[in-house]
C-alpha cells in the first residue's frame, strides 16, 4: 500500500513539476526590467527564452520573437537546450511511469517489469529536474553578471550615435517557476526510485544456498542480513511481499526461493 502511495505521489509530483517546466520554458518573464527606485514605469521591458516584450503604460504590449538563431548568445541557446531536454525527458518519464503505476494493470505485466519501469521513469524525472534547475540557474547567473555591467552603452539610431543608459534586468517570474518545477520533478523522481525499491523483490539477493557437507545433511543459509531484512532461520517458505512479486532473476534461477534442503 505504501509503495503504491509513494509511486502515485511521485507520479503526481513529477507531473506538476514537468507542467511547471513547460510553463516556465514558454513564459516571457525570464528577465524583467529592474525598477529599483522607480516602481511605476511608462515602458516596462521583459524577456523570455523565445521573445522579448514591452508593456507600455497605455496597456499596449508588443512582443518580438528572436528570429535569429546564430545571433543569439550561446548561454541563451544552452538554457533553451537544457529546458527542452528537461521537457523531453520528463515527458518520456511520464509516459513510462503511467505504465509502471502499480494501480494500473496492463495485461500480465510482471511487477518486476513495473519496478524497472518505475526506476527508469524516476531517473528520467531526476535528470529532467536537474536540467530545468541547471537551465534556470545558468540564466540567473547570466542576469547577475549582466546586471552590474549595464552601464552607459552606445546605440546607433536614426540620428547617429546616441548616449543611452542600458536597461537593467532582474529575475523574472519564470525563474522561480522553473526552480520550483525542477525541484518538484526531482523530488517526484526520487519518490519513484524509492517506490521501485519497494516494488522489486529483494529476496533475489538473499536466496538460500545449499551446501552439502560430506557425511552431513546440513543446509547453510547466510544470516548476515538478519537485522536488515527480517530473514532468519525460521523464514523458510515465507513470502516477504504480499504482492508476490518475482524478479526476472528469480524466474530464471532453477532452484527457487522455495528450495527445500
Amino acid at each position: 500500500m505504501a509503495v503504491t502511495a509513494c509511486q502515485g505521489l511521485g507520479f503526481v509530483v513529477s507531473l506538476i513539476g514537468i507542467a511547471g517546466i513547460i510553463a516556465a520554458t514558454c513564459m516571457d518573464q525570464w528577465s524583467t526590467q529592474d525598477l529599483y527606485n522607480n516602481p511605476v514605469t511608462a515602458v516596462f521591458n521583459y524577456q523570455g527564452l523565445w521573445r522579448s516584450c514591452v508593456r507600455e503604460s497605455s496597456g499596449f504590449t508588443e512582443c518580438r520573437g528572436y528570429f535569429t538563431l546564430l545571433g543569439l548568445p550561446a548561454m541563451l541557446q544552452a538554457v533553451r537546450a537544457l529546458m527542452i531536454v528537461g521537457i523531453v525527458l520528463g515527458a518520456i518519464g511520464l509516459l513510462v511511469s503511467i505504465f509502471a503505476l502499480k494501480c494500473i494493470r496492463i495485461g500480465s505485466m510482471e511487477d518486476s517489469a513495473k519496478a524497472n519501469m518505475t526506476l527508469t521513469s524516476g531517473i528520467m524525472f531526476i535528470v529532467s529536474g536537474l536540467c530545468a534547475i541547471a537551465g534556470v540557474s545558468v540564466f540567473a547567473n547570466m542576469l547577475v553578471t549582466n546586471f552590474w555591467m549595464s552601464t552607459a552603452n552606445m546605440y546607433t539610431g536614426m540620428g547617429g550615435m546616441v548616449q543611452t543608459v542600458q536597461t537593467r534586468y532582474t529575475f523574472g517570474a519564470a525563474l522561480f517557476v522553473g526552480w520550483v518545477a525542477g525541484g518538484l520533478t526531482l523530488i517526484g523522481g526520487v519518490m519513484m526510485c524509492i517506490a521501485c525499491r519497494g516494488l522489486a523483490p529483494e529476496e533475489t539477493n538473499y536466496k538460500a544456498v545449499s551446501y552439502h557437507a560430506s557425511g552431513h545433511s546440513v543446509a547453510y543459509k547466510p544470516g548476515g542480513f538478519k537485522a536488515s531484512t527480517g530473514f532468519g532461520s525460521n523464514t523458510k517458505n515465507k513470502k516477504i511481499y504480499d504482492g508476490g512479486a518475482r524478479t526476472e532473476d528469480e524466474v530464471q534461477s532453477y532452484p527457487s526461493k522455495h528450495d527445500y534442503v
Epitope: Q33, N38, V40, T41, A42, V43, N45, Y46, Q47, S52, C53, V54, E56, S57, S58, G59, F60, E62, R64, Y155, G157, M158, V162, Q163, T164, V165, Q166, T167
Partner: antibody, heavy 118, light 113 residues
Amino acid sequence: QVQLQESGPGLVKPSQTLSLTCTVSGGSISSGYNWHWIRQPPGKGLEWIGYIHYTGSTNYNPALRSRVTISVDTSKNQFSLKLSSVTAADTAVYYCARIYNGNSFPYWGQGTTVTVSS
Amino acid sequence: DIVMTQSPDSLAVSLGERATINCKSSQSLFNSGNQKNYLTWYQQKPGQPPKLLIYWASTRESGVPDRFSGSGSGTDFTLTISSLQAEDVAVYYCQNAYSFPYTFGGGTKLEIK
C-alpha cells in the same frame, strides 16, 4: 469613438480645493486604459498631472503629488481630479485624456478653464 | 524628470515650403526592448485641445496627412512638414512618452510667412 468631457467650477478661491470631473462616453472607463489629467496655463505649455486606472491605481506628477487626488467612479463612467491648496499658478485649462499606443494621447476632452482668484 | 527643449520658439514658413521643428530631450527616449523611441508630436490650434500627429517618433497617427513626418533617435528629434498648408498654422509640442512624469516641450509656434 471615445469622447471625453470635463466639467467643474470655472472659478476657485486661493487655498481652496479645485474639483473637476471627466465623463467618458462612447466607451467604458473599465476598458483597461489609464485616464489622465493634463493642464495648460494660459499662453504656456502642457503639464501632465497624473492618471488613474479603473482599478483605482494612480500615478501623479511628483511636482503636484502632495496636492493631487484622482479618483474613479466606474458606475458613472467618470473620473475626477482634486487639487488642494490652489494658488494663482494653478490657473489653467484642464484637459482629461486617454492614453494609447506609444504612451500618446489621441483622445482629449475639450478642456475646461479654471481661474484661481479671490 | 526629462526636460524637453524645442527649437525654434516660433517659425515662419511660406505656403508650400518645408517646415522643420526640433526637439531635444535631456535623456534618451530610446527603448532597447522594442527598438523604439518614445517621443510624440502634437498640433494645437487656438481654443482646441492638442491633436496627436506622431508617436514612437516616426509613426503617423491615422488620419494625419502624409506631409507630416517624424524622425530622430535617442535625444534628438525632428518634425517635418514637407509642404506647408494654411491649416497647419498652430503650436507644435513634443512629448516625452518614455518615463514618468510625462513632460512636454515648450512649443513651437508655426506661422505663414
